[in-house]
Interface confidence: medium
C-alpha cells in the first residue's frame, strides 16, 4: 500500500505559444486538475478506467481576466494530488494529467467545464525514490509538475511489498501486542531462511526462520491450533493453550470517518461512507460544486462538505465517481469475427477481410455462395450484393416471374405483348415508338428525330 503524489508547478502557454491565458473565458473561471494512473506502459484510450486510481485537485482561485492586461502568474490549486494505491506499486505506469477550466459564468450564465489539456507520460518509477520533475507540452500549453510514489508503513521497498519490522525483535508484555514502534530501518532481505514467511516469521541471524507466536513449521506457515479454539488468531495463552486474539490489520480500526474495515490477505480494506474516499477514508470535503462525477455523471446531494454526494452515472459508466467505463466490447457487437474497439465516444469494429459495415455485418464476398435463379447474375458493390435478373424475372433472388406488361407500359392505347426478350407494344393508329409515346403528325412526319431504317408508323415496337 502507498500513495502516488503529484505536484503541479505551473500551467500556461509554452515557449513560442500564443501569449494567452487559460483563463480567457467570458467571465470568471478557475482551473483544476485530474490525475489518472494506469498500470503498464501500453497505449490506452484516455477514457479507459484508471485502474491504479484517480484523483481530483481542489479548485484554484477564481480569476477574471483583465482586458489588455498581461497575463499574471496563473493561480493554481493548492496542495498535492494524492492517489492512494492498495496493492503493490507496479513500477511501470501511465500517468494522465488533465487540466480543466471551470467557467463560472458568461452572458448565458452558469458554470461549464472545458478540458484544456491532457498529457500522458509513460515511464518507470520505483516507490520510495525522490521527486521526479517533468515538463510536458499539450498543444500550445505547457505543464510543469513533479511526482513520486511512496509506501505507507509498514510497507516498504520499490514496490511497497515488503513489510517493515523493527530491527530489534521485541518481546511482548501482558497486552500480547508488539510493543516496539515500527522503525525506519527494516530487515534487509534475504537474511532469513529462503521461503520464511514474510508475515509470520522473522530472523535475528542470517539463515534462520523463527516464528511469531501462533505460527509454527520450518517456514512459519502452519498456524498453531487446538481442537477447542480453531480459527482464532494470535499468540497462544500459556494458561489455556488456546490462541488469544492477536494483532490483526483491522485492530484499532484504521479506517477514518466511520469507514468499516475488512481484512484482506496480509492487509485491510476500508469501505468508506459516502463523501469520503482514500485508503483509510481520509479524503473528504468533496461536494457537487467540485464536480466529482466524471463522464457526464449527474451529481446529487453534497451541497456542503458535511453532506455526502452521489454520482448517477450515464449508460456505459460505473464507479462511485463514474470514472470506470463499462466494457461494451464484452457484448461482442462485432459480427463475422470483427475486432471490437471501445474508443470511448463510440464503438468501432475492425472487420476481417471480406466484411464491412458498422458491425461487420455485410459480407462483401456474398456472391461466392449466392445463387441467383433463372439466369440472374450476382452483383457486388458498396458492401452489399444484389441479383441482376434476366428479363422476365424479378425479386431478390430472381425467383419471381415478372410480367413486363403488368405496369401497362404502352402509351396511348397501345397493346402490350410479353416477349422472351422483353415486351412489344402494338401502337394504336397515329402513334409510334417503343412505348407508343410519339404521335405521328398529319403530314406523316413523326415526332422522332429519325426512325430506324425499315420502320413504319404503326409497326409494333420492341422494347429492349
Amino acid at each position: 500500500a502507498g500513495v502516488f503524489e503529484l505536484q503541479i508547478h505551473s500551467f500556461g502557454p509554452g515557449p513560442g505559444g500564443a501569449p494567452r491565458s487559460p483563463y480567457s473565458a467570458r467571465g470568471p473561471c478557475r482551473l483544476f486538475f485530474r490525475v489518472c494512473l494506469k498500470p503498464g506502459l501500453s497505449e490506452e484510450a484516455a477514457e479507459s478506467p484508471c485502474a491504479l486510481g484517480a484523483a481530483l485537485s481542489a479548485r484554484g482561485p477564481v480569476y477574471t481576466e483583465q482586458p489588455e492586461a498581461p497575463a499574471p502568474d496563473l493561480p493554481l490549486p493548492n496542495g498535492l494530488l494524492q492517489v492512494p494505491f492498495r496493492d503493490a506499486w507496479p513500477g511501470t505506469f501511465s500517468l494522465i494529467i488533465e487540466t480543466w477550466r471551470e467557467e463560472l459564468g458568461d452572458q448565458i450564465g452558469g458554470p461549464a467545464w472545458s478540458l484544456l489539456a491532457r498529457v500522458t507520460r509513460r515511464r518507470r518509477l520505483a516507490a520510495g525514490g525522490p521527486w521526479a520533475g517533468d515538463i510536458q507540452r499539450a498543444g500550445a500549453w505547457e505543464l510543469r509538475f513533479s511526482y513520486r510514489a511512496r509506501c505507507e508503513l509498514p510497507a516498504v521497498g520499490t514496490a511497497c511489498t515488503r513489510l517493515c519490522r523493527p530491527r530489534s525483535a521485541s518481546r511482548c508484555g501482558p497486552g500480547l501486542r508488539p510493543c516496539a514502534p515500527l522503525e525506519d530501518e527494516c530487515e534487509a532481505p534475504p537474511v532469513c531462511r529462503a521461503g520464511c514467511s514474510l508475515e509470520h516469521g522473522f530472523c535475528e541471524q542470517p539463515g534462520e526462520c523463527r516464528c511469531l507466536e501462533g505460527w509454527t513449521g520450518p517456514l512459519c506457515m502452519v498456524p498453531v491450533s487446538t481442537s477447542s479454539c480453531l480459527g482464532l488468531r494470535g499468540p497462544s495463552s500459556t494458561t489455556t493453550g488456546c490462541l488469544v486474539p492477536g494483532p490483526g490489520p483491522c485492530d484499532g480500526n484504521p479506517c477514518a470517518n466511520g469507514g468499516s474495515c475488512s481484512e484482506t490477505p496480509g492487509s485491510f480494506e476500508c469501505t468508506c461512507p459516502r463523501g469520503f474516499y482514500g485508503l483509510r477514508c481520509e479524503v473528504s470535503g468533496v461536494t457537487c460544486a467540485d464536480g466529482p462525477c466524471f463522464n457526464g455523471g449527474l451529481c446529487v446531494g453534497g451541497a456542503d462538505p458535511d453532506s455526502a454526494y452521489i454520482c448517477h452515472c450515464p449508460p456505459g459508466f460505473q464507479g462511485s465517481n463514474c470514472e470506470k467505463r463499462v466494457d461494451r466490447c464484452s457484448l461482442q457487437p462485432c459480427r463475422n469475427g470483427g475486432l471490437c474497439l471501445d474508443l470511448g465516444h463510440a464503438l468501432r469494429c475492425r472487420c476481417r477481410a471480406g466484411f464491412a459495415g458498422p458491425r461487420c455485418e455485410h459480407d462483401l464476398n456474398d456472391c461466392a455462395g449466392r445463387a441467383c435463379a433463372n439466369g440472374g447474375t450476382c452483383v457486388e458493390g458498396g458492401g452489399a450484393h444484389r441479383c441482376s435478373c434476366a428479363l422476365g424475372f424479378g425479386g431478390r433472388d430472381c425467383r419471381e416471374r415478372a410480367d413486363p406488361c403488368a405496369a401497362r407500359p404502352c402509351a396511348h392505347g397501345g397493346r402490350c405483348y410479353a416477349h422472351f426478350s422483353g415486351l412489344v407494344c402494338a401502337c394504336a393508329p397515329g402513334y409510334m415508338g417503343a412505348r407508343c409515346e410519339f404521335p405521328v403528325h398529319p403530314d406523316g412526319v413523326s415526332a422522332l428525330p429519325a426512325a430506324p431504317p425499315g420502320l413504319r408508323p404503326g409497326d409494333p415496337q420492341r422494347y429492349p
Epitope: G139, W141, G291, H345
Partner: nanobody
C-alpha cells in the same frame, strides 16, 4: 478532415417546433463545449445556448430560456437543439460551434424561418 454540419432548419408557423441537429467528425467531439449561435439579417451573431463537453451543464440566453433545450450524444457525435413555441423573432441562420481552448469549429448554418 473536420466537418460540422447543421440540419433540421425550415419554415415553421409561430408557436411551432423544430429540432436542429449538428453532426461533427474529424476531431475529439467529447472534449468540446458546443455553442449554438444565430444571426438574423442585419444583426450581430448571438449565442443562444451552450452545453459543456460532458453534457452536464447547459446555459441559455434569456431569449431562449424555457423554450429551447440543448442536448448532446457523445456516442453519436451529435448535438440537438429542440426549439418549441417559436416566434417570428427566432427567424435566423443557426450555427453550430465547437469550442475548446485550442480550436474552434463552425458549421455553415441552417436557416430557420418563423412565419405565418
Amino acid at each position: 478532415q473536420v466537418q460540422v454540419v447543421e440540419s433540421g432548419g425550415g419554415l415553421v408557423q409561430p408557436g411551432g417546433s423544430l429540432t436542429l441537429s449538428c453532426a461533427a467528425s474529424g476531431f475529439d467531439f467529447s472534449t468540446y463545449t458546443v455553442n449554438w449561435y444565430r444571426q438574423a439579417p442585419g444583426k450581430e451573431r448571438e449565442k443562444v445556448a451552450r452545453i459543456s463537453s460532458t453534457g452536464t451543464t447547459t446555459n441559455y440566453a434569456n431569449s431562449a430560456k424555457g423554450r429551447f433545450t440543448l442536448s448532446r450524444d457523445n456516442a453519436k457525435n451529435r448535438v440537438y437543439l429542440q426549439m418549441n413555441n417559436l416566434k417570428p423573432e427566432d427567424t435566423a441562420v443557426y450555427f453550430c460551434n465547437f469550442e475548446r481552448f485550442d480550436s474552434n469549429y463552425w458549421g455553415q448554418g441552417t436557416q430557420v424561418t418563423v412565419s405565418s
